[in-house]
């Protein structure tokens, strides 16, 4: 069978101060199993942006229902976006284990900020 | 209409081995992880082992002697049991994983189960 | 180790009458709890997932409550059909996934 491969759709998305920036990512698998978590920026000092067990995300939403079976769509939406948020996304799967481990990673979509329009 | 028929189950000896099967049917059986539970005479579910693509993970009271496999091209899913022990008599149901949403794995779909007495 | 306590262990109660059930999580579990029903010699069915949410085909008066580590099923008006064995699981953190012991609900 295919492995399962992480799709984030879009290279870049443009987004004026101060309104939501939706980040697109899809699995095309349910399995291996363990969870989904989002990151801005690539290596070690990468910032965890969305993570749905532990930490608070006040301006992370997720974009589908939270009741949704099956779901393999991880597409998130970041609110009230400011010039500090922009960098690349990376949507990545882990696979579950003590401690999980990283399994694979979208190609990242890159944010950019557009000064708010007066 | 899913599907799930446990077999391989019966009396064996502490010490012995047995190998469950559990064929599935009525839905795409690659796409999802599969689980073993077990329930001993008159006492509550224990979950035994659960299996995804390559990753397999173990209740500590299994772990070094079931072995958890699955072969997609058969819609089978297998519990090779080991140094089999008299606390591991019960009956053994295989169960379909479900998700929702973000989070982790519950079993919409079990099996009749098969029973399995380690006795001497 | 997220250990599930089901209280009472035993309900005794009269066809019609509401019948409730609960699940307490040694720690947080957010929504990630299900609830099963098993008959005499038969497997589990599961009757409700996230906490709150009915399986298809689940009658409506089975419903789910709770989040964090308080959860409860309520059966509003329990059926012959409806004396069974119910077990509450979380699947927050896992491996393992845990059960609870168990509430059997019996004929008054």
């Known amino acids: 069978e295919e492995e399962l491969q992480v799709i984030q759709p879009d290279k870049s998305v443009s987004v004026a101060a101060g309104e939501s920036a939706i980040l697109h990512c899809t699995v095309t698998s349910l399995i291996p199993v363990g969870p989904i978590q989002w990151f801005r920026g690539a290596g070690p000092a990468r910032e965890l942006i969305y993570n749905q067990k532990e930490g608070h995300f006040p301006r992370v939403t997720t974009v589908s229902e939270s009741t949704k079976r099956e779901n393999m769509d991880f597409s998130i939406s970041i609110s009230n976006i400011t010039p500090a948020d922009a960098g690349t996304y990376y949507c990545v799967k882990f696979r579950k284990g003590s401690p999980d481990t990283e399994f694979k990673s979208g190609a990242g979509t890159e944010l950019s900020v557009r000064a708010k329009p007066s | 209409e899913v599907q799930l028929l446990e077999s391989g189950g019966g009396v064996v000896q502490p010490g012995g081995s047995l190998r469950l099967s559990c064929a599935a049917s009525?839905?795409?059986?690659?796409?999802?992880?599969m689980t073993w539970v077990r329930q001993a005479p008159g006492e509550g579910l224990e979950w035994v082992s659960t299996i995804g693509s390559g990753d397999t993970y173990y209740a500590d009271s299994v772990k070094g002697r079931f072995t958890i496999s699955r072969d997609n091209s058969k819609n089978t899913l297998y519990l090779q049991m080991n140094s089999l022990r008299a606390e591991d008599t019960a009956v053994y149901y295989c169960a379909k994983d479900s998700t929702v949403s973000w989070s982790g794995d519950f079993f919409d779909y079990w099996g009749l189960g098969t029973l399995v007495t380690v006795s001497s | 180790e997220i250990v599930l306590t089901q209280s009472p262990a035993t309900l005794s109660v009269s066809p019609g009458e509401r019948a409730t059930l609960s699940c307490r999580a040694s720690q947080n579990v957010k929504n990630d709890l299900a609830w099963y029903q098993q008959k005499p010699g038969q497997a589990p069915r599961l009757l409700i997932y996230a906490a709150r949410i009915r399986e298809t085909g689940i009658p409506a008066r089975f419903s789910g409550s709770g989040s964090g580590t308080e959860f409860t099923l309520t059966i509003s008006s329990l059926q012959s059909e409806d004396f069974a064995v119910y077990y509450c699981q979380q699947y927050y953190d896992w491996p393992p996934f845990t059960f609870g012991g168990g509430t059997k609900v019996e004929i008054k």
């Open positions: 009525g839905f795409s059986f690659s796409n999802f992880a």
